[in-house]
Interface confidence: medium
């Protein structure tokens, strides 16, 4: 039977009442145009929304626009349109809210074709109150806030100016021209790279790459011959032109530019591109695309240096179009990674880390799931999970994947069971355990959200009819009760929930359509009297992450540790409330094989904890190049995996002498360049 | 200890060409905004031109657009001004100094250029 | 272009007396506002930056201040080798620089 249709399915009591008393709905005065909603603050309760309406006329196009704000989870909206002096506000930089609990927002206006530069509204108390800022320039991008310190702004310009704020947007300096991308590193430091040729385009390959630590007073340039540049985690990279050619690599640097080395990655050519797809303190996942138009590449994952580099996944899916990749970050479980992989004969198939990329499996086929018909053996087959791709690509999937750090080992997907992922409308999946064992959730594709830290389920089905339920579970997903929210069914157009899946609010957004008019409208159900008691300690359960064989002793073991979770049982329909914290137990394991990625010029054979030599480099030294000179590299083929905390048991030799040579780790003076690097 | 030791400036007619030299020392020279300043004899200071620390951006006085080019090598820790078309108010000591914050903060020591028939 | 104005031209005082020399920038130039020192037959010594910041080695008798259009150098307490000739000199919104005519502070 389908899920939440079993016997065993007990239904939460008088939930239509409780929700009933607990649903506020709010209808817009508004012509439908387009919406946006932002979050100010955290547990603040304050939802600013923005709608937009644009009238084309023959000569112009008339807009109008009207803001409005909740400071009680989106129940009830106030109009405060007058707050900026009724000003349209321009979408594309949508609402600029500061970082944390600063309670700051900044709104760009619409202005005339001749003025001398843009507006602002800007707002330091949560919305209440707005300040209007004529601005000394026309804004290219949205107003970006210092992570450290959210009265330091900056902005580009129409001009190519960097523009920087230090209080709050209230004076604006140029502190650069020509500038063709600016990021805020830590400490209120500012990356950027400028042109020297007329523009950004026409310089790409011949960028230099600046730095000022004191908000423009004072300027290094750090690099020449930039591409472009990113930051991940405590990494700075950049994409830097080769002397002799066409070909671009990656340096990378750890102390904010001051020393580069170059990346023990493949170089690329005009038409590839490299990506970082994730980064932490410890590592980098770095995505670095095949020649030709292949939609394909390899991932690598670094030292802890993000120098050497190990190949990680091959045939990675990332399309050069569009740029989309389906790679996901389970956030719900530590080392857990979702991507797709495009095989020999053109069809996608997910593939899962649970070691932070040290070895790629298939999802493990859901119990309750039939393999589809692009599995070759009806037995034998995997899930396979709808992302960005496939979103891109216009199939019926409304929703990425799912998952939230405080709701422990939830992960909820769309997906598909056969050989590949499939065109037909997918189902719905969850897993409760990070991702090792997979469960049909809900059949045809959905909206859905988690609140109350995994407490609650909330989904909406995705149709192109007008919808008036909802479902929602309390029980990991097991089991669906549904509640009908409005007697007039409504266009859904989005769920929205406050980021940090703590709340106990859903808003469902739709609009109504009536002969003449159409308004949007919003309903906010709020879900406090369905978990009507806290949960107390009998509520929890211990939970060992990555358990894969209770026999062994080192089941759980991942990346040199393990952890105990307290988790909600499922059969508890309490609130784990706004306050709750993951409780957890880490435990260190011994040293194994698995803990050790493969080194440099090494590499592991699928299903093999094994490292061996490349073919390519068998015979030959290995040598590679950090902070300008050139190291040999002694090895049997491991090196521990970065932030991998195992003790005693397997280890493996690994010596790195210096040669004594120069080498091309230095970009700043790349006439030097004579690498012997692989 | 930062240095810099500017060279080339001599006796020239109008109309002549000069390159001055300034070579740099006890810092990373690659990292750092560089100018020139020049000085008429008896008169105030003068900005002449400025580059950025990877050779890509340059900017001049009006006075000299067209006419002057700095350059640097980074591999050899040197600044340039190659100077075309020199006319008697070009007449100066030229010095070399490293950019900070909103000034410079080392100077050399300055080569006198003069032009004259 | 951004022209800055400084007075007085010449500023005779004795030593340990206070002297007070002024800068005015026809624009705003914020706080990118530098003060040097030059003495004859040598190169201008930086004093102060980013119109309050003393630079490397500077004796605590100098001070800058102001911001916008406005700047001041102040020496505290004149000591004998502090009589030279004060440039202030300014960075718009990019490379670009001015340098003032100069103020000569002399002994009376």
């Known amino acids: 039977s389908a899920p939440g249709e079993d016997e065993e399915c007990g239904r939460v009591r008088d939930f239509v009442a409780k929700l009933a008393n607990n649903t506020h709905q709010h209808v817009f005065d508004d012509l439908r145009g387009s919406v946006s909603l932002s979050w100010v603050g955290d547990s603040t309760g304050v939802i600013l929304v923005l709608t937009t309406f644009h009238v084309p006329l023959v000569i112009m196009t008339f807009g109008q626009s009207k803001l409005y704000r909740s400071e009680d989870y989106g129940k009830n909206f106030k109009d405060i349109t007058d707050l900026i002096n009724n000003t349209f506000i321009r979408t594309e930089f949508g609402m600029a809210i500061g970082p944390e609990n600063s309670g700051k927002v900044v709104l760009t206006a619409e202005v005339s074709g001749g003025s001398r530069g843009g507006r602002i509204f800007r707002s330091s108390d949560f919305a209440k109150n707005f300040v209007q800022t004529d601005l000394p320039f026309h804004p290219l991008t949205q107003m970006m806030y210092s992570p450290q310190n959210s009265d330091y702004l900056l902005a580009l310009s129409t001009e190519n100016g960097l523009w920087v704020s230090k209080n709050f947007g209230g004076k604006w300096e140029e502190i650069h021209k020509a500038v063709c991308l600016a990021k805020w590193g830590s400490d209120n430091t500012i990356f950027f790279t400028t042109y020297a040729n007329g523009s950004c385009k026409a310089d790409l390959g011949a960028l230099e790459l600046w730095r000022t630590s004191d908000l423009g007073k004072s300027f290094k340039t750090i690099g020449v011959k930039i591409y472009s540049f990113g930051l991940g985690g405590r990494f700075l990279f950049a994409s830097v032109m080769a002397d002799k050619d066409t070909t671009r690599r990656i340096h990378v640097s750890t102390d904010q530019g001051d020393t580069w080395s170059m990346a023990q990655l493949p170089s690329v050519g005009q038409e590839q591109f490299y990506s970082i797809l994730a980064a932490n303190d410890d590592m980098v996942f770095m995505h670095v695309d095949e020649p030709g138009d292949t939609g394909f590449g390899t991932i690598f994952t670094s030292d802890d240096r993000g120098i050497v580099y190990s190949k990680s996944l091959d045939r990675h899916l990332y399309t050069t179009t569009g740029g989309e990749t389906d790679f996901t970050n389970v956030t719900s479980l530590r080392g857990v990674y979702i991507t797709s992989v495009l095989s020999e004969d053109n069809s996608i198939q997910t593939m899962i880390t649970f070691d932070q990329g040290g070895r790629w499996t298939h999802l493990r086929k859901p119990e309750n799931s039939e393999c589809d018909a692009t599995a070759k053996n009806k037995n034998e087959c995997s899930l396979h999970i709808h992302a960005s791709y496939s979103i891109s690509q216009k199939l019926n999937v409304p929703m990425a994947p799912l998952s939230e750090p405080n709701a422990v080992g939830i992960v909820i997907a769309h997906g598909s069971v056969g050989d590949a992922i499939s065109v037909m409308v997918p189902d719905v999946y969850i897993s409760d355990d990070g991702g090792y064992s997979w469960t049909k959730m809900l059949e045809g594709p959905h909206y859905y959200t988690i609140l109350d830290s995994g407490g609650i389920i909330v989904a909406i089905e995705h149709s192109s009819r007008p919808i008036n339920v909802i479902k929602f579970s309390t029980d990991e997903g097991q089991c669906w009760q549904t509640y009908t929210f409005t007697r007039d069914p409504i266009y859904f157009t989005g769920l929205a929930s406050e980021p940090g899946a703590r709340s106990m609010n859903i808003s469902i957004w739709g609009f109504t359509e009536s002969f003449l008019t159409s308004q949007w409208v919003s309903y906010t159900i709020d879900f406090k009297d369905i978990l009507e008691r806290n949960c107390e300690e009998k509520d929890y359960t211990i939970w060992l992450a990555h358990s894969t064989d209770p026999e062994d002793y080192e089941d759980g073991c991942i990346l040199g540790y393990k952890e105990q979770f307290l988790r909600l049982r499922k059969s508890s329909v309490c609130q784990n409330g706004r306050d709750y914290v993951v409780t957890k137990q880490p435990s260190i394991c011994l040293c194994s094989l698995e803990d050790f990625l493969c080194d440099f010029g090494y590499y592991r054979p699928e299903n093999d904890s094994k490292c061996v030599e490349q073919p390519e480099l068998k015979g030959h030294d290995l040598e590679f190049c950090l902070y300008g000179r050139e190291e040999h590299l002694t090895t049997n083929g491991y090196r521990k995996i970065p932030g991998d905390k195992c003790q005693g048991g397997v280890n493996p030799v690994r010596e790195v002498k210096d040669l004594k040579k120069k080498c091309t780790s230095n970009f700043l003076s790349p006439e030097k360049q004579n690498s012997k690097s692989n | 200890e930062v240095q810099l030791l500017e060279s080339g400036g001599g006796l020239v007619q109008p109309g002549g060409s000069l390159r001055l030299s300034c070579e740099a020392s006890g810092f990373t020279f690659r990292s750092y905004v560089m100018s020139w300043v020049r000085q008429a004899p008896g008169k105030g200071l003068e900005w002449v031109s400025t580059i950025s620390g990877g050779g890509g951006n340059t900017n001049y006085t009006d006075s000299v657009k067209g006419r002057f080019t700095i350059s640097r090598d980074n591999s050899k820790n040197t600044l340039y001004l190659q100077m075309n078309s020199l006319r008697a108010e070009d007449t100066a000591v030229y010095y070399c100094a490293k950019n900070w914050g909103s000034g410079f903060d080392y100077w050399g020591q300055g080569t006198l250029v003069t032009v004259s028939s | 272009e951004i022209v800055l104005t400084q007075s007085p031209a010449t500023l005779s005082l004795s030593p340990g007396e206070r002297a007070t020399l002024s800068c005015r920038a026809s624009q705003s130039v914020s706080s990118y506002l530098a003060w040097y020192q030059q003495k004859p037959g040598q190169a201008p010594r930086l004093l102060i930056y980013d119109a309050s910041n003393r630079a490397t080695g500077i004796p605590a008798r100098f001070s800058g201040s102001g911001s916008g259009t406005d700047f001041t150098l102040t020496i505290s307490s004149l000591e004998p080798e502090d009589f030279a000739v004060y440039y202030c000199?300014?960075?718009?919104?990019?490379?670009?620089?001015?340098f003032g005519p100069g103020t000569k502070v002399d002994i009376k």
């Open positions: 000199q300014q960075r718009s919104n990019w490379l670009i620089f001015t």
